[in-house]
Interface confidence: low
Amino acid sequence: DAHKSEVAHRFKDLGEENFKALVLIAFAQYLQQCPFEDHVKLVNEVTEFAKTCVADESAENCDKSLHTLFGDKLCTVATLRETYGEMADCCAKQEPERNECFLQHKDDNPNLPRLVRPEVDVMCTAFHDNEETFLKKYLYEIARRHPYFYAPELLFFAKRYKAAFTECCQAADKAACLLPKLDELRDEGKASSAKQRLKCASLQKFGERAFKAWAVARLSQRFPKAEFAEVSKLVTDLTKVHTECCHGDLLECADDRADLAKYICENQDSISSKLKECCEKPLLEKSHCIAEVENDEMPADLPSLAADFVESKDVCKNYAEAKDVFLGMFLYEYARRHPDYSVVLLLRLAKTYETTLEKCCAAADPHECYAKVFDEFKPLVEEPQNLIKQNCELFEQLGEYKFQNALLVRYTKKVPQVSTPTLVEVSRNLGKVGSKCCKHPEAKRMPCAEDYLSVVLNQLCVLHEKTPVSDRVTKCCTESLVNRRPCFSALEVDETYVPKEFNAETFTFHADICTLSEKERQIKKQTALVELVKHKPKATKEQLKAVMDDFAAFVEKCCKADDKETCFAEEGKKLVAASQAALGL
């Protein structure tokens, strides 16, 4: 349905408030270093222009594409060359190359200051003084730090952010009311950003087919009563939504997501019995709720898969007629029967099935050739099961912090070339799999753990891609999306690594560590642990544990001392000397 003016169409569909918010997000995700005020000015100019197009769709420039309009606006920024360097060269290109160029310059790790949370009273005053600016600032700060954040979902976060301040700024104890809500939003926001980053990586690095396969598996687990044709329709629509958002087409994405939520709710009888509550909510809550909805119950008496996919004499005929449809049906049928499997495992099984059919359908006796294909699945299923069992046992034995430390050591030995901040961030997140998933019963552990690990390893992949330092990381990240986790699991100690020179400065600490939060103090200690392993990759667990225990005791002792700084200086020298002796540095 072509519209004379795309910008007028989206403005009318989304409404002024959502239109302005989405344009702000889009601009902040592209120009991550620009000041807030500059972005607000650009957004206001675009909004005024959109209103003229709503009044008269034939007005000058109203027929231009959104990429053209937004790109032209971004290219008016005076300091583009000074602030962004070669990104300014994008402005010399025509659409669609210009937008592709902007996309390629999105920075997953922008050099921006850490967001420091002001005092509660200061935040409440700012909220009351100018609520609109306060909320726009939130959108801007999140969007520029997370350039792939799922824009319609960020609107939902902003709505909850506003609700938290509206409620808590009138409470008797503002801090007790507000701070836990802000912590929850921060943690959920980071998780949401990372999940969306994997979707975009899947689309951009491995193509639409890979994303669709993921979506078939996930939606079939979630909606096992839905027919294959229904799941296929949802997958097609969902792929369009995420392709748009990952491509910077945020207005189209938000509009299409709303349409998809509407369709799902109008057809919930043929999709899932779990959607009723979601569908009674307002739009933003509804879309979020649908995305998180629990798996529906599996239909009773589903027949054995073997009949259609192994025993049937028509397997090769059906496969040859429409390969992707047949494989899609296999994935749908397998996934709806296995909510206990991770999506990546289901995709590995589908890949094994595809490889077998490719080989066997060209053989003299195809049926005999693929007759045992399901036997090949068993080891693929057992590998993640065993890995999760072992790691959950380790987590229960050690607790989260020490489990993170075990992973820090493991991953630093595998890929010691990776930067220390990246190793700390990724290993801390890998370690969170314990508290997130090990509490679940067996039937929910694998989908929780392995699909979460896929998200975290994607963080490693996108951070490493910006500054590649390890061929092993590049290989695990690029060769197969679904085998990333097994690939990293299989990496042994990197024997080619030349240990880092010892630098006492790395292990020099000051009294400021005493005022840090527990989390920040852990990060300091974990940073030191990574550096230790980089200096002495052959150090044993026992040696590292002894040094870390000494380090913890040193910090505790000096933080209790009267003259903290002197204690850190003198005791620190002793600790470094003792550590060097213990590790043979």
């Epitope: 693929l380 590998e383 092993r472 290989k475 097994p486 690939c487 299989a490």
Partner: nanobody, 115 residues
Amino acid sequence: QVQLVESGGGLVQPGGSLRLSCSASGSIWGIYHMGWYRQAPGKQRELVASITVDGSTHYADTVKGRFTISRDNSKNTLYLQMNSLEPEDTAVYYCDIRNVGGDYWGQGTQVTVSS
């Protein structure tokens, strides 16, 4: 690219034993599955035993209790210890290694069980 070379096959009497080896070279990191398959004359290739990266093993029902799969990471070698061999075990035995780069097969080694 991964190169696989099997050895240890031969002629053995029923009830006898053999130990197959599969030596891997090339880009062998990132392995997540290693297995032994066999193909008897006029039949399709079938899985005999497999071992995952964490050391868990899986055996075909016909060889359970008689065959043992193992690996030596330091030598990049996969083994199949075959005891109480039966004439039905006669086949060409192939070693298979899967890593992130793909699925790799050896050329096969002939095992003949006959009196």
